[in-house]
Amino acid sequence: GVFNYETETTSVIPAARLFKAFILDGDNLFPKVAPQAISSVENIEGNGGPGTIKKISFPEGLPFKYVKDRVDEVDHTNFKYNYAVIEGGPIGDTLEKISNEIKIVATPDGGSILKISNKYHTKGDHEVKAEQVKASKEMGETLLRAVESYLLAHSDAYNEQKLISEEDLGGEQKLISEEDLHHHHHH
């Protein structure tokens, strides 16, 4: 069966800037700003467009070791991103894939709304585990807020037509120091 879960969440970050950081450069940004949630993102095949396969690895202590995502659509004009979780994590005997749609919509106050749709494609009559839906939502929220905190702390980042560089994330300006990681992410 197919089980659809839709959520909306707001952000103070303008839609174009959030799309650049959260969607287009998430692979680079997530392990830097949320290492407690994602340890690495590896491009298996493709150049970021439809058909691209990515392997997202999780740090020790989380329920799953990795997932593989397939990019289905990247719409730069409408700030829309569709992808599917096709391997690893919860995918297995009872779950075939999870199709995800993220649309970032500008709001009149200069912020944005993220409209998220998660379709769980189960095998046969199997239902979706509530814990899985909750964990997935929490992961998304963690990543979004970590990216927001970075963008609020670095006024220039992703404001122009450039993605963040290693240099921008390094030195005194990196968001999370080793000391901070020790204090805040390994309690």
Epitope: S11, V12, T142, L144, R145, A146, E148, S149, L152, A153, H154, S155, D156, E172, Q173, L175, I176, D180, H183, H184, H185
Partner: antibody, heavy 118, light 107 residues
């Protein structure tokens, strides 16, 4: 209306730890829209940023104070706190807590005077 | 770190005068500059953000300009309540840094 209020001892002995708390009312420190911070001003001198915290616990500190500073947050109480270790007379100042919107300090507490003296 | 330098450190002026205070950043900060006013024994008050945007409630005689490394705060016609110390602050990224302040005194 958002209000911030600093609290803590007004006198700290040299080499001890200065501890201050900022209580936020009329708003929530759990908002993902803002950072929160501590700033100080020694008598007759300018403003010095000490450090800032995001509701998730991520922190930034002034490099010159980093080895002595810890800022933490208690979202359940809408409070964030400052600890400054191994204080000397040079740490005597008015200490302010503030809300940061896009890195501008748009709401400040009234400030609390901390004197370091034996 | 980005260093902020204000000039002059103090200035004497009379009511009705036009006063300009400058602030220089040690590296480009685009328009990420903030100005504050502080009166003796009082809390700093946000005047201008993003180099030229007036904070709500701030009188129109205050204006800001500049981009990159050089910025100015202008008071077009000084009022008695404007005598205070003014600070600039870069809002590009942490660590936040302030200018040393400019004290505006009555001549």
């Amino acid at each position: 209306q958002l209000q911030l209020q600093e609290s803590g001892p007004g006198l700290v002995r040299p080499s001890e730890t200065l501890s201050l708390t900022c209580t936020v009312s009329g708003g929530s420190i759990s908002s993902s829209n803002y950072w929160w911070g501590w700033i100080r001003q020694p008598p007759g001198k300018g403003l010095e940023w000490i450090g800032s915290i995001y509701y998730s616990g991520i922190t930034y500190y002034n490099p010159s104070l980093k080895s002595r500073v810890t800022i933490s947050a208690d979202t359940s109480k809408d409070q964030f706190s400052l600890k400054l270790r191994s204080v000397t007379a040079a740490d005597t100042a008015v200490y302010y807590c503030a809300k940061l919107e896009w890195l501008r300090l748009d709401f400040w507490g009234q400030g609390t005077t901390v004197t370091v003296s034996s | 770190d980005i260093q902020m330098t204000q000039s002059p450190s103090s200035v004497s002026a009379s009511v009705g005068d036009r006063v300009t205070i400058t602030c220089r950043a040690s590296q480009g900060i685009s328009s990420w500059l903030v100005w504050y006013q502080q009166k003796p024994g009082k809390v700093p008050k946000l005047l201008i953000y993003a180099a030229s945007s007036l904070q709500s409630g701030v009188p129109l005689r205050f204006s800001g300009s500049g981009s990159g490394t050089d910025f100015t705060l202008t008071i077009s016609s000084l009022q008695p309540e404007d005598f205070a110390t003014y600070y600039c602050q870069q809002a590009k990224s942490f660590p936040l840094t302030f200018g040393q302040g400019t004290r505006l005194e009555i001549k």
